[in-house]
């Protein structure tokens, strides 16, 4: 018993005066608690407690479940403890079967003895397993035994408390123990579509996958720069343990124009966050916006290939698409695909392949696309390069020697003169006069240029050269004169070919 | 014998928050998990969340994450749930529960919060 | 999350007549042969009261007509003999694994 000064308060006394008492099931247990100012007993097994305010507390028949730490307090608040063992060979433990673990933490598996002079009071696997190799705990018959620093691998591991009880090993009810995993990583997230793009009064909805090792972590739809509430659903799976995923779903079953921004899916834990975000754009109508990949005007020389190509932008997806020439639609020589298999591509692109452009082939070429909403077209102005073409060349009764030669870009016609039999002809001969004329082709086709001179100018035999030449080549065209005393007696025009 | 005694009935406006008491005896307040269980009128019973005894770890219902808190007081053996954000899908019965022996074997008498404007 | 579904969702029965409440989880709710599936009895006004915990252990102070079966993923409730006062509603409740979950109950009347 304990001993104080006098003129201290002192503790209440206990009778009988030991810290342990042993007693046999079905006998009486009796305790006497003296203080002058006596307030209560109190009684406490598996954390639980029982008050009487008599000073003696007698139980006439013990049972297992008086098992227990039997305490008396008196006024100053001094209290005294006797505990007490109600030896049942049919019951040696008393159990609470809830047992939680944290990682890394200590945790209780309480199955206090009912009696304290059996032996070997440890833990063991149910049906025969052994314990994890690493696992450790340390008894205490009072209280049960404690396992040291859980670890997630004996999540859902099932065990007895166990004793020797006249050679023979007696173990108690099974345990199974839950660990609550530490978070030692930042949940994972991801979106089910980094972007959306809807009509006005279409339904957005988005999913946000968490993964993480419990249901403990923390997720939440937020709009960036807002704080409204949005209306989550959830589904959450156990993948095994510690493999915890919810997806959570946020949805507007109206979308407006301005709900359009990001949205933002956030997760945390005790050790970090982590986020992920998707984009929403809400319009009005649908729209087709078309960018040409090449310069809408054209110019492709006589022979050779061009590809128009252009790149659109449609929503909703495009419904027919056609390229146009002179009224008449390509069935072929096209194709139109999407810039990219992603479920929210709205990009598109078109090619027409036009091969050996002919000279009479030019013109406007028309892209039109249309999808539900709305319809979009663009035009290329094509224009074939030719080799000028020298059309006439003659000599007018007025005296003058005309030249008319086509192509395009718009030739430009040079005249030279060679004296006697000389094949080059080097003297420029200035032309009287130049006329563009008005094709009766289609617009884009070749260009018609006259060209005259006099001539009564030339005085000797030789030859006349009409040169006709663009960016594309050259023609030539000839007149041979031969006098006769003082006539002109002939004038034979011809052609040669100058590449 | 264990006990569970509950505050008293609440109303608030959509929006305010609500804390709601539960003051345990008959037993060692740390050493048991307190549950929180609520029941809306004339529905079923619908578990919040836990606080784990020891050291005071919490795991919520996703449905009430973000808005519901507890905690306790373990110089009085008080357990305090705090919901926030209320709406009228709040108004509801909430009530403490003490896990004993893998079951919810204790109850508190319930605490009605009315959310109305 | 585990989904616990109770048939039926009310019934009528009268006094002395033999009761059966079912409820099936969405998994199993067994590790290691505990089944974590417990009853509750609620009378209007009243705070829930535990009848049946780890499947068929009865609580103590509850009447024996009380017996809890079952495991895995389906349950029972039985009630031998009904008496006046075991008119009220009656849940099942897994706890393992979280989020803990209730079946939506089932309102036993007299008839």
């Known amino acids: 018993q304990p001993s104080v000064s006098p003129g201290e308060p002192s503790p209440p006394s206990i009778h009988p005066g030991k810290s342990d008492l042993i007693v046999r099931v079905g006998d009486e247990i009796r305790l006497l608690c003296t203080d002058p100012g006596f307030v209560k007993w109190t009684f406490e097994i598996l954390d639980e407690t029982n008050e009487n305010k008599q000073n003696e507390w007698i139980t006439e028949k013990a049972e297992a479940t008086n098992t227990g730490k039997y305490t008396c307090t008196n006024k100053h608040g001094l209290s005294n403890s006797i505990y007490v063992f109600v030896r049942d060979p049919a019951k040696l433990f008393l159990v609470d079967r809830s047992l939680y673990g944290k990682e890394d933490n200590d945790t209780l598996v309480r199955c206090p003895l009912t009696d304290p002079e059996v032996t070997n009071y440890s833990l063991k696997g149910c049906q025969g397993k052994p314990l994890p190799k690493d696992l450790r705990f340390i008894p205490d018959p009072k209280a049960g035994i404690m396992i040291k620093s859980v670890k997630r691998a004996y999540h859902r591991l099932c065990l007895h408390c166990s004793v020797d009880q006249e050679g023979k090993s007696v173990l108690s009810e099974k345990f199974i123990l839950k660990v609550r995993p530490a978070f030692k990583a930042v949940p994972v997230v991801s979106v089910s579509k980094a972007s959306y793009l809807l009509r006005e009064g279409e339904e957005f909805t988005v999913t946000c996958t968490i993964k993480d090792v419990s249901s403990s972590v923390y997720s939440t739809w937020k709009r960036e720069n807002s704080q409204t509430k949005l209306q989550e659903k959830y589904n959450s799976w156990h993948h095994g343990d510690f493999n915890y995923e919810r997806q959570a779903t946020l949805t507007i079953s109206s979308a407006r124009v301005n709900d359009s921004g990001v949205f933002m899916c956030y997760a945390n834990n005790t050790f970090g966050s982590a986020n992920v975000t998707t984009t929403l754009e809400v319009v009005d109508k649908g729209f087709i916006n078309i960018f040409p990949m090449i310069n809408t005007t054209v110019f492709v020389n006589d022979g050779e290939n061009v590809d128009l190509i252009v790149e659109y932008e449609a929503f909703p997806k495009p419904e027919h698409q056609q390229w146009i020439y002179m009224n008449r639609t390509f069935t072929d020589k096209w194709e139109d695909y999407p810039k990219s298999e992603n479920e929210s591509n709205i990009r598109y692109v078109s090619e027409l392949h036009l091969t050996r452009l002919k000279g009479t082939e030019g013109g406007t070429y028309t892209f039109l696309v249309s999808n539900s909403d709305v319809n979009a077209a663009i035009a290329f102005n094509v224009y074939v390069n030719t080799k000028p073409e020298i059309l006439t060349y003659d000599r007018l009764v007025n005296g003058m020697l005309q030249c008319v030669a086509a192509g395009f870009p718009e030739p430009t016609i040079d005249w030279y003169f060679c004296p006697g039999t000389e094949q080059r002809c080097s003297a420029s001969v200035l032309p009287v006069d130049v006329q563009t004329l008005n094709s009766s082709g289609p617009p884009f086709g070749k260009l018609v240029v006259q060209s005259s001179i006099d001539s009564s100018a030339f005085k000797h035999n030789g030859t006349v050269e009409c040169k006709a030449y663009n960016d594309v080549g050259k023609t030539s065209a000839y007149f041979n004169f031969a006098f006769k005393g003082n006539n002109k007696e002939q004038i034979h025009p011809h052609t040669l070919f100058t590449p | 014998q264990v006990q569970l005694v509950q505050s008293g009935a609440e109303v608030k406006k959509p929006g305010a928050s609500v804390k709601v008491s539960c003051k345990a005896s008959?037993?060692?307040?740390?050493?048991?998990?307190m549950h929180w269980v609520r029941q809306a009128p004339g529905q079923g019973l619908e578990w919040m969340g836990v606080i784990y005894s020891g050291n005071g770890d919490t795991s919520y219902n996703q449905k009430f994450k973000g808005r519901v808190t507890m905690t306790t007081d373990t110089s009085t053996s008080t357990a305090y749930m705090e919901l926030r954000s209320l709406t009228s899908d709040d108004t509801a019965v909430y009530y403490c529960?003490?896990?004993?022996?893998?079951?919810?074997?204790?109850w508190g008498q319930g605490t009605l919060v009315t959310v109305s404007a | 999350e585990i989904v616990l579904t109770q048939s039926p969702s009310s019934l009528s029965a009268s006094v002395g007549d033999r009761v059966t409440i079912t409820c099936r989880a969405s998994e199993s709710v067994d590790i290691y042969g505990y089944s974590f599936m417990h009853w509750y009895q609620q009378k209007p006004g009243k705070a829930p009261k535990l009848l049946i915990y780890l499947a068929s252990n009865l609580e103590s102070g509850v009447p024996s007509r009380f017996s809890g079966s079952g495991s895995g993923t389906d349950f029972t409730l039985t009630i031998s003999s009904l008496q006046p006062e075991d008119f009220a509603t009656y849940y099942c409740q897994q706890n393992k694994e979280e989020p803990y979950t209730f079946g939506q109950g089932t309102k036993l009347e007299i008839k």
């Open positions: 529960a003490r896990e004993r022996d893998t079951r919810f074997g204790n």
């Open positions: 008959g037993y060692t307040f740390t050493s048991y998990n």
